[in-house]
């Protein structure tokens, strides 16, 4: 009686179990109940990454420079080529087929994590006692001056934005 | 037998262009990615450029991005390396490598001189 | 770009002896998609092209005697010569096959003593 589901790594076809071709490899001839499934090898450029019984293999992704992409993991026949984006720009999708640059986090705002080729920089506002007064993808927020430690006292008050201002102690209050 | 062979090679003055060849034989050509890499004493072996079969993706390095053209005519089973801009630096023995995800066959080479 | 160090830059033996040489890379070589090191060894002799010795870390070229054995996963390799013959004399590179830019150790070279 002919078969109704086939082992791992098999298929059915003509109520016959035929093997799936292996990773790096796709379908040339099904098998019969003569002969064994025939496989070629995926060309130089493409893949397929299963168990499987393709007739065509994927080509593999082009990490285009121009786009702002460099590859971080070679194609093969087995696995896709892996794309990130060069330095200071970052993938607009998890596929990462584009990048845009990383970017600032504004006066007042701090970084809490930097960018990296797949994500990102995330910004946090100072918090008190806390600034930034640049606009950076690398800073984070500064603590305002401690001016008791350099004897001085607080002149002008400290922002989100900017230090506080130490001057000397008014000597006459004294 | 499978072969590579590369020619053009020459004496070429700082600034000059140069195109090399790669003339392919006893494979099918087209079935291959194709690279070139040079070595001189000074920096050792250093892949250059990478050209794959099929639609023909690119890849550079750094050092000739923007000076260095890689391109390959299936139909003459040839690969080409066009050279601008040059620099003492480019001074190397060029060879192109046939790959199918590492390099399995290299040309004998050809020199390539950077010098007023 | 991922850096290949080579080491020793040279090793003087003697014929039948047993040689080992490292090569380590800045980043790991292991395609987690397959599990295979993208990690090349190629000899190369006086005025000749480097000629392929192994590839995917322990994939020994067809035609390569088997005195020659590649080992080592991720960071770390080993290129052994279990008895070293008069024409095993060569330099020896490893080379970064993994990601763009392709990269080559500077070279361990084989003397004979």
């Known amino acids: 009686e002919p078969p109704t589901a086939c082992r791992e790594k098999q298929y059915l076809i003509n109520s016959q179990c035929c093997s799936l071709c292996q990773p790096g490899q796709k379908l040339v001839s099904d098998c019969t109940e003569f002969t064994e499934t025939e496989c070629l090898p995926c060309s130089e450029s493409e893949f397929l990454d299963t168990w499987n019984r393709e007739t065509r293999c994927h080509q593999h992704k082009y990490c285009d420079p121009n786009l702002g992409l460099q590859v971080q993991q070679k194609g093969t026949s087995e696995t896709d080529t892996i794309c990130t984006c060069e330095e200071g720009l970052h993938c607009t999708s998890e596929s990462c087929e584009s990048c845009v640059p990383h970017r600032s986090c504004l006066p007042g705002f701090g970084v809490k994590q930097i960018a990296t080729g797949v994500s990102d920089t995330i910004c946090e506002p100072c918090p008190v006692g806390f600034f930034s007064n640049v606009s950076s993808a690398f800073e984070k927020c500064r603590p305002w001056t401690s001016c008791e430690t350099k004897d001085l006292v607080v002149q002008q008050a400290g922002t989100n934005k900017t230090d506080v201002v130490c001057g000397p102690q008014d000597r006459q209050r004294a | 037998e499978v072969q590579l062979v590369e020619s053009g090679g020459g004496l070429v003055k700082p600034g000059g262009s140069l195109k090399v060849s790669c003339a392919a034989s006893?494979?099918?050509?087209?079935?291959?990615?194709m690279n070139w890499v040079r070595q001189s004493p000074e920096k050792g072996l250093e892949w250059i450029a990478y050209?794959?079969?099929?639609?023909?993706?690119?890849y550079y390095a750094d050092t000739v991005k923007g000076r260095f053209t890689i391109s390959r005519d299936n139909a003459k089973n040839t690969l080409f390396l066009q050279m601008t801009s040059l620099r003492s630096e480019d001074t190397a023995m060029y060879y192109c490598?046939?790959?199918?995800?590492?390099?399995?066959?290299w040309g004998t080479g050809t020199t390539v001189t950077v010098s007023s | 770009d991922i850096v290949m160090t080579q080491s020793p830059s040279s090793l003087t033996v003697t014929a039948g002896e047993k040689v080992t040489m490292s090569c380590k890379s800045s980043q790991s070589l292991l395609n987690s998609g397959n599990q295979k090191n993208y990690l090349t060894w190629f000899q190369q002799k006086p005025g000749q092209p480097p000629k392929l010795l192994i590839y995917w870390a322990s994939t020994r070229e067809s035609g390569v005697p088997d005195r020659f054995t590649g080992s080592g996963s991720g960071t770390d390799f080993t290129l052994t010569i279990s008895s070293v013959q008069a024409e095993d004399l060569a330099v020896y590179y490893c080379?970064?096959?993994?990601?763009?830019?392709?990269?080559f150790g500077a070279g361990t070279k084989l003397e004979l003593k």
């Open positions: 490598a046939r790959s199918w995800g590492y390099f399995d066959v």
């Open positions: 050209i794959s079969s099929g639609r023909g993706n690119i």
């Open positions: 006893g494979f099918t050509f087209s079935d291959y990615g």
């Open positions: 080379q970064n096959d993994y990601t763009y830019p392709l990269t």
